[in-house]
Interface confidence: medium
Amino acid sequence: AGLKLMGAPVKLTVSQGQPVKLNCSVEGMEEPDIQWVKDGAVVQNLDQLYIPVSEQHWIGFLSLKSVERSDAGRYWCQVEDGGETEISQPVWLTLVPRGSSAHHHHHHHHSAWSHPQFEK
């Protein structure tokens, strides 16, 4: 009912070896089970977490401690709702060589969301 799924940012360019945090806002579900997808395949073996903003508003994070070339690609998040799979807009993650100055297109982060994770 009135599910909103938003991924951010639309494009993110980072230097190799730097950390990256993607987030996904889900509204209209009490307990979403957010899945992250990269280039069409569900992301496995990566740490992710939810933060409950309110009962029907959750933020999902996908965090990488140290980005390598293999991490570049098109990411989106998805949730199951009433048997339907809802997907967010994609986020393009591109890399520049280590030490280069990357132009970051960051989604605004509320400080309360900046919490520890495991993936670098």
Epitope: E31, Q48, W58, L64, H115, P116, F118, K120
Partner: antibody, heavy 125, light 108 residues
Framework: EVQLVQSGADVKKPGASLTISCQAS????????ISWVRQKPGKGLEWMGR????????MYGPSFQGHVTISADRSTATAYLQWRSLEASDTAMYYC??????????????????WGPGTLVTVSS | SYELTQPPSVSVSPGQTARITCSGD??????AYWYQQKSGQAPVLVIY???KRVSGIPERFSGSSSGTMATLTISGAQVEDEADYYC???????????FGGGTKLTVL
């Protein structure tokens, strides 16, 4: 104020069954993971596993998979750690820990801030 | 199963710098966390995400990570810092969590 109240110390014989509990208060029980950590006398910390109470999603450390069962009762905001058959090597202090953030199923980070006082389990013939 | 390796003990004199290391194959891609446990007490988190100090923890505590090694540094160790210190991280596939074996810090 977040509180984790654990059941009292227990002494059991090898082969006995046991369930220890961890009752949570001061927050929404279903929004957070509860983990269990073992510490044998004079030894280090060992991560046993955890549960997301709302969906009963569990994860176990390799050393504990199949030997213990972690469960939760949403109606009483209580998490449990259960053994079907205790061994002398299970003698330890067991801490329940609330993770800092609500987290999704699968592979999850934990930022341990709230620890229970511990339950001492002694297994001896 | 995945392991994090720490030295069993580290000794320093008061005011000296103590360094406690933690080695693990997944640490290039996984964050390390550090806990302090004083005798008879529950552990307390001091450092998270390799190098971030928890609010209320003295500035003399710092963390770093390079390659497969994470390090907890206590600059100007005090007698009250005597405790067991544990690193904590995730397995390579993220499916479970692991504590290091612990390091007993003695401040003589």
């Amino acid at each position: 104020e977040v509180q984790l109240v654990q059941s009292g110390a227990d002494v059991k014989k090898p082969g006995a069954s046991l369930t220890i509990s961890c009752q949570a208060s001061g927050y929404t029980f279903t929004d957070y993971w509860i983990s269990w950590v073992r510490q044998k006398p004079g030894k280090g910390l060992e991560w046993m596993g955890r549960i997301r109470p709302l969906l009963s999603h569990t994860m176990y450390g390799p050393s504990f998979q199949g030997h213990v069962t972690i469960s939760a009762d949403r109606s009483t905001a209580t998490a449990y750690l259960q053994w079907r058959s205790l061994e002398a090597s299970d003698t330890a202090m067991y801490y329940c820990v609330r993770s800092w953030l609500a987290t999704s199923g699968g592979t999850i980070p934990e930022y341990y801030q709230h620890w229970g006082p511990g339950t001492l389990v002694t297994v001896s013939s | 199963s995945y392991e994090l390796t720490q030295p069993p003990s580290v000794s320093v004199s008061p005011g000296q710098t103590a360094r406690i290391t933690c080695s693990g194959d997944a640490l290039p891609k996984k964050y390390a966390y550090w806990y302090q446990q004083k005798s008879g007490q529950a552990p307390v988190l001091v450092i998270y995400e390799d190098a971030k100090r928890v609010s209320g923890i003295p500035e003399r505590f710092s963390g770093s990570s390079s390659g497969t090694m994470a390090t907890l540094t206590i600059s100007g160790a005090q007698v009250e810092d005597e405790a067991d210190y544990y690193c904590y991280s995730a397995s390579a596939n993220g499916n479970y969590r692991v504590f290091g074996g612990g390091t007993k810090l003695t401040v003589l």
